[in-house]
């Protein structure tokens, strides 16, 4: 009597069962009474990540250097391609489908978290005592010169943008 | 479509040199390129691959003491900082296949600059 | 660290006949492994990508096969004008599974 249903990695087609092709190989024939299931590996940027009957491979993603992506992983013929952003961009989604340059942080602020491939530039704002005077994706807020330590006095405040000028002690004559 | 290596010269150890890949008929905005170079009597070494966006990539070996990069729409450039008697060798510039990917294989090649480091 | 090793390192044999050269790469590269030939005093010369799949102009007397770790360039059908060197070389994803083997020197009787 005809099968109704086959075993794992197998499928039915005419009342028979038929081995699935392995990953990275599609199906060429079916099958018969007398013959295997015929199957043919994928060819270049094509893959098939299943147990398969599949007549044609699927084709490698496109890691597009005109949105800032390039190849992080081959595919192979069992795995689709990976791609990351060029360094300097990050990904606009977790898919990785474009990218986009890291933000900086303007004067002012400061980098709290470096931007990685997959996440953008954190800036946080200088607190007090603290300065930022550039835009920039990596420079955190830097300390105010300690005046005292240099045996110098505060001459001109600072900012959350610039640095304290020190000057030398009024000599008392 | 061609390729043309120059800059090689004898060079003392510790100093540095700049090779030039200058290109005809190649579109360095839709090609990458890659230097490779050989030893005399010896085999081909990868040394890196510029992608179209500039990204580079480098053998283990070669990070930090090369440096590949784009000068102009027809030439790249590979510059050597402190080389030693073993960087003696024919250094070739090359077309590689993806424009995204600095691990391929390269369909079509400069004759080769020779550079030899002694003192 | 990543290694192609080629064999043999030479290899001879008379016009007409074939000679096979082997590859073998330290791990998996799928089938991402192209083979050159070198003439003296000229630059390399891509014959074979992504395993087996033959350069426009390049005879099919050569044929390249394998996938994984394993690879071979067989030559058949030997003609004076494929004395050279050949190469291999991996481009896979990793810095140093971008790399060549040895080279094998094809005599030609």
């Known amino acids: 009597e005809p099968p109704t249903a086959c075993r794992e990695k197998q499928y039915l087609i005419n009342s028979q069962c038929c081995s699935l092709c392995q990953p990275g190989q599609k199906l060429v024939s079916d099958c018969t009474e007398f013959t295997e299931t015929e199957c043919l590996p994928c060819g270049e940027s094509e893959f098939l990540d299943t147990w398969n009957r599949e007549t044609h491979c699927h084709q490698h993603k496109y890691c597009d250097p005109n949105l800032g992506l390039r190849v992080q992983q081959k595919g192979t013929s069992e795995t689709d391609t990976i791609c990351t952003c060029e360094e300097g961009w990050h990904c606009t989604s977790e898919a990785c489908e474009s990218c986009v340059l890291h933000r900086s942080c303007s004067p002012g602020f400061g980098v709290k978290q470096i931007a990685t491939g997959v996440s953008d530039t954190i800036c946080e704002p200088c607190p007090v005592g603290f300065f930022s005077n550039v835009s920039s994706a990596f420079e955190k807020c830097h300390p105010w010169t300690s005046c005292e330590t240099k045996d110098l006095v505060v001459q001109q405040a600072g900012t959350n943008k610039t640095d304290v000028v020190c000057g030398p002690q009024d000599r008392l004559r | 479509q061609s390729l043309e290596e120059s800059g090689g010269r004898l060079v003392t150890p510790g100093g540095s040199l700049t090779l030039t890949c200058t290109v005809s008929g190649i579109d360095l905005s839709t090609n990458g390129m890659g230097w490779v170079r050989q030893g005399p009597g010896k085999g081909l070494e990868w040394i890196g691959t510029i992608r179209v966006t500039g990204g580079t990539d480098y053998a283990t070996w070669a990070k930090g003491r090369f440096t590949i990069s784009k000068t102009s729409s027809t030439t790249v450039d590979l510059k050597m900082t402190s080389p030693t008697t073993e960087d003696t060798a024919t250094y070739f510039c090359a077309r590689g296949h993806a424009n995204n990917d600095a691990y391929v294989y390269f369909n079509l090649w400069g004759q080769g600059t020779l550079v030899t480091v002694s003192s | 660290a990543f290694e192609l090793t080629q064999t043999p390192a030479s290899v001879e044999a008379g016009v007409g006949g074939t000679v096979t050269i082997k590859c073998q790469a330290s791990q998996s590269i799928d089938r991402y492994l192209a083979w050159y030939q070198q003439k003296p005093g000229q630059p390399p010369k891509l014959l074979i990508s992504y395993t087996s799949t033959l350069t426009s102009g390049v005879p099919s007397r050569f044929k390249g096969s394998g996938s994984g770790t394993e690879f071979t360039l067989t030559i058949s059908d030997l003609e004076c004008a494929d004395a050279a060197t050949y190469y291999c070389?991996?481009?896979?994803?990793?810095?140093?599974?971008?790399?060549f083997g040895g080279g094998t020197e094809v005599v030609v009787k």
């Open positions: 070389q991996s481009y896979f994803t990793s810095d140093d599974a971008n790399t």
